[in-house]
């Protein structure tokens, strides 16, 4: 058993049929010594008396808010949550496996630049009685500070018969050094509580590996005289790190017909313009990637050929 | 050329070669043997490699003030990785795949380090750790980790040379 926060405790249980459970001793936070009784949740049934209460925690029915009273007055509460371990593996029932980039990916994180600011998100099908708490640091043995905000519900989607909820959180490294080569990864820890179930999820990454620039901006076409060719131009996204002579992007320009089956013409360039042939009913798209480190490409910015 | 005395490197040549190094480091990564490393701990085996850190003057402002600190750091790293690529970590069993561009990567590391420090000039170089894994699978694991950290190192070096070519070239 360990304390998650004031008056909230997590009991770690090996979860299998007829498991013995864990013996837990609760102590009433009071100078009083006599006349103390204990109850669980809203029940008025007295579970025991005295300053301490010893219970055997085996299942969710044994978890909940234990309260000690004296003469009708509440003295203190202890909320017990359960953290299940099945076959040596901690349960992951609350969050959905996003399976990208690999199985058992519950947290996904992205950064738009090298400033030390990043966003993480996760998915669940649970709509009520759910709380999240997020902590982060750079490195684990001698952690350096990363400040995270509160997790918020950022999207709701319908997936078949199920509703899916997306939560996200923004974090900022306290003393970011955008130009340095990271040697210690960022660690992100999410505590999830659903009713009386506790779970924790972690992710470890370098900012450089989660970079995904915003799409190029101000995508424009300029027809070239007496030719089917057009000059496509664009600009770096506003959110990208500066100066651009240091934090450079590379670009992929694609000409795509209406039908997905049509041949795509692709050009790679480090410049912010390119000359391509504009086919009828086609569209021109441009996306960006860090020039020197192969993290994610941005989403496409597109304009129609006509 | 960035000689210890303090003259400027051939920024544009360094820019081209460092950008080439980035491509080679990425293209070599899947081709050093077959293995999924995602589950392996990253910290222990590669903390000995030199990193370009915050105080090394490799940020735009530090380069403007005095690029020598940064160039020396990059040079140390290049020599370090060049030695690793020539060691039995890469030459031993299991053999690199035939398609692997590690030979080009090795030659380019040496080429860039020579651009930074021509014969006859000497910056002190970092001691190469004795990373000598006994098992072939350990060697494979180490190759992956070395290439992963090399990718990060050459990315910073390439940014330095790109910025230098754009703003510090005479």
């Amino acid at each position: 058993i360990w304390e998650l926060k004031k008056d909230v405790y997590v009991v770690e249980l090996d979860w299998y049929p007829d498991a013995p459970g864990e013996m837990v001793v609760l102590t009433c936070d009071t100078p009083e010594e006599d006349g103390i009784t204990w109850t669980l949740d809203q029940s008025s049934e007295v579970l025991g008396s005295g300053k301490t209460l010893t219970i055997q925690v085996k299942e969710f029915g044994d978890a909940g808010q234990y309260t000690c009273h004296k003469g009708g007055e509440v003295l203190s509460h202890s909320l017990l949550l359960l953290h299940k371990k099945e076959d040596g593996i901690w349960s992951t029932d609350i969050l959905k496996d996003q399976k990208e980039p690999k199985n058992k990916t519950f947290l996904r994180c992205e950064a738009k630049n090298y400033s030390g600011r990043f966003t993480c998100w996760w998915l669940t099908t649970i709509s009520t009685d759910l709380t999240f708490s997020v902590k982060s640091s750079r490195g684990s043995s001698d952690p350096q500070g990363v400040t995270c905000g509160a997790a918020t519900l950022s999207a709701e989607r319908v997936r078949g018969d199920n509703k899916e909820y997306e939560y996200s959180v923004e974090c900022q490294e306290d003393s970011a050094c955008p130009a340095a080569e990271e040697s210690l990864p960022i660690e992100v820890m999410v505590d999830a509580v659903h009713k009386l179930k506790y779970e924790n999820y972690t992710s470890s990454f370098f900012i450089r590996d989660i970079i995904k620039p915003d799409p190029p901006k101000n995508l424009q076409l300029k027809p070239l005289k007496n030719s089917r060719q057009v000059e496509v131009s664009w600009e770096y996204p506003d959110t990208w790190s500066t100066p651009h002579s240091y934090f450079s992007l590379t670009f992929c320009v694609q000409v795509q017909g209406k039908s997905k089956r049509e041949k795509k013409d692709r050009v790679f360039t480090d410049k912010t313009s390119a000359t391509v042939i504009c086919r009828k009913n086609a569209s021109i798209s441009v996306r960006a990637q860090d020039r020197y480190y192969s993290s994610s490409w941005s989403e496409w910015a597109s304009v129609p050929c006509s | 050329r960035a000689v210890p005395g303090g003259s400027s490197p051939a920024w544009t040549q360094c820019q081209q070669l460092s950008q080439k190094l980035c491509t080679l480091a990425w293209s070599a990564h899947p081709l050093v043997g077959h293995m999924d490393l995602r589950e392996e701990g990253d910290e222990e085996t590669t903390n000995d490699v030199p990193h370009i850190q915050c105080g090394d003057g490799c940020d735009p402002q530090g380069l403007r003030d005095n690029s020598q600190f940064c160039l020396q750091r990059i040079h140390q790293g290049l020599i370090f990785y060049e030695k690793l690529l020539g060691s039995d970590i890469f030459t031993g069993e299991p053999s690199l795949l035939p398609d692997s561009p590690v030979g080009q990567l090795h030659a380019s590391l040496l080429g860039l380090s020579q651009l930074l420090q021509p014969e006859g000039h000497h910056w002190e170089t970092q001691q190469i750790p004795s990373l000598s894994p006994s098992q072939p699978w350990q060697r494979l694991l180490l190759r992956f980790k070395i290439l992963r950290s090399l990718q990060a190192f050459v990315a910073v070096a390439a940014r330095v040379f790109a910025h230098g070519a754009a703003t510090l070239s005479p």
Partner: antibody, heavy 116, light 107 residues
Amino acid sequence: QVQLVQSGAEVKKPGASVKVSCKASGYIFITYWMTWVRQAPGQGLEWMGQIFPASGSADYNEMFEGRVTMTTDTSTSTAYMELRSLRSDDTAVYYCARGGGGFAYWGQGTLVTVSS
Amino acid sequence: DIQMTQSPSSLSASVGDRVTITCRTSENIYSYLAWYQQKPGKAPKLLIYNAKTLAEGVPSRFSGSGSGTDFTLTISSLQPEDFATYYCQHHYGIPFTFGQGTKVEIK
């Protein structure tokens, strides 16, 4: 299994251009360098250049003085080698080969004949 | 550019003979050397890479050795299907260069 299938033989006039294609299958195209090698009749092998499909980054043998361009179409896993300002001594079999080191897989070769 | 000097340029041998072909480079190429076999009208076939590693499907009578600037391809017992032209190629930095070839003929 890995296969590289090249376009058919070409006959060109001096000064013209030729574009040879190499369609790859059986592997992840963008992960490997594609190299072009040529062999004049009765002669040895000559490295022309290489391209990395994931980024479009290419390197050329200086011998070809800017006459060669290598491109890839990742949507069809096809590599192209275009040689311009053809001369009679460009008559050769042109091969694509996978990789940026030793070449374990080769195309069947494309004979380009330059003759007036 | 790295120069490759292959010798001999041709040799005559009988089935069962031990054949050795050498390749010398103008500068240190570590172990980044490949050997190919080519038959008329066919693409080259990779035999050895990284100086000593046998490519997939290549008979064990072929072996490679050497590092730095001096390399050797050995065929321990020549078979009828081994009569062909053999090339060495370095893969240490570009441009890659090939040796001029060694033609192995029937005595």
